[in-house]
Amino acid sequence: LPAQVAFTPYAPEPGSTCRLREYYDQTAQMCCSKCSPGQHAKVFCTKTSDTVCDSCEDSTYTQLWNWVPECLSCGSRCSSDQVETQACTREQNRICTCRPGWYCALSKQEGCRLCAPLRKCRPGFGVARPGTETSDVVCKPCAPGTFSNTTSSTDICRPHQICNVVAIPGNASMDAVCTSTSPTRSMAPGAVHLPQPVSTRSQHTQPTPEPSTAPSTSFLLPMGPSPPAEGSTGD
């Protein structure tokens, strides 16, 4: 004969566990129904009655099957340096990530707690390492034969143009100037930009910031404060 299906609440067999989407209520000593995401337990089960669930109120949520008495509060509104990549619903918390040009200097389980502007490399310096969602830009001095004449968190050092006759030699912060109307060939037709990091919902990813406005607070976590940008504007 087929085993009889037990309906909640029911007493589990000795040594067995409750089924999926059920929990063992210590008081009733019964297997009872969990509430679905977006709901919470309004009334706990007894030996004769199952869990009574109710929808989460506005600005609260439950993401998992649960038997919590109250839904969790959604996080506060995203700050001005952040974008809301996931709205607060009855089934999910709000997620804030850093807006383009910023990176996450202090992450939390989901999203970002503190965004900071990506460092800008000053003229004579280019981006050695682009900003990521979780790390700042790193700059480097432009090597001989290359230059950057911008203050930017994305521009790399570009080769000097090649002249038939050089009027003014290029340096780290200026392109060469040719005497003829057009150079033999220009190796650097325009500013080369690095792609901005994309804000994703991946666990520890961060966008990009600009340094001069970065908060000055040092967060003494297990290890310290935040990052510098090569050849920054503040030198």
Partner: antibody
Amino acid sequence: EVQLQQSGTVLARPGASVKMSCKTSGYTFTSYWMHWVKQRPGQGLEWIGTIYPGNSDTSYNQKFKGKAKLTAVTSASTAYMELNSLTNEDSAVFYCTRENLLLRSYFFDYWGQGTTLTVSS
Amino acid sequence: DIVMTQSPASLAVSLGQRATISCKASQSVDYDGDSYLNWYQQKPGQPPKLLIYAASNLPSGIPARFSGSGSGTDFTLNIHPVEEEDAATYYCQQSNEDPRTFGGGTKLEIK
């Protein structure tokens, strides 16, 4: 607990290539720059370069371009450094180290135990 | 590249006294009011260990007898009072731009 475990001592011939590894655990591998540092016997520390495992971006010390190649396998949370055209000058201890880029500072907070490379004919 | 110059190359300090190590950068390692200068301690057969970051900040677990100061191009590491276990080589390192560069090291001996 953050850990960086490097491969063991290597003995190689001049002209050969070697590849050493740095296996990480205890943190999100794709979220931190991994650096490599060289230390010749009785000498100071020399920065080789760095890789960001999240997208494989690299930045090298000009001196080591063409000498060192940095790679990472995210599924194994392991960084690698390959050194080619070996000479006696490449005999050294090589460290992998994680760079922490927190708000308003960058620093190497965790280091591997080092891989000793001896180049000898 | 930023050249980091440490002095002295070695020093011997009596137990309980003060050890002072200097580090000079060939150009400023400051950005937006912060100094990107770190100090590491290395003992024979061991990897370097972070001692001070951002010129003056102590990571957790580092004794308060270690302190760092300075900005721009001139930085100082102080150890007071010096203990036996502080015998090691100390390196400064700038993290303001690539390539990252280290000082030549200062070997501290305890008398």
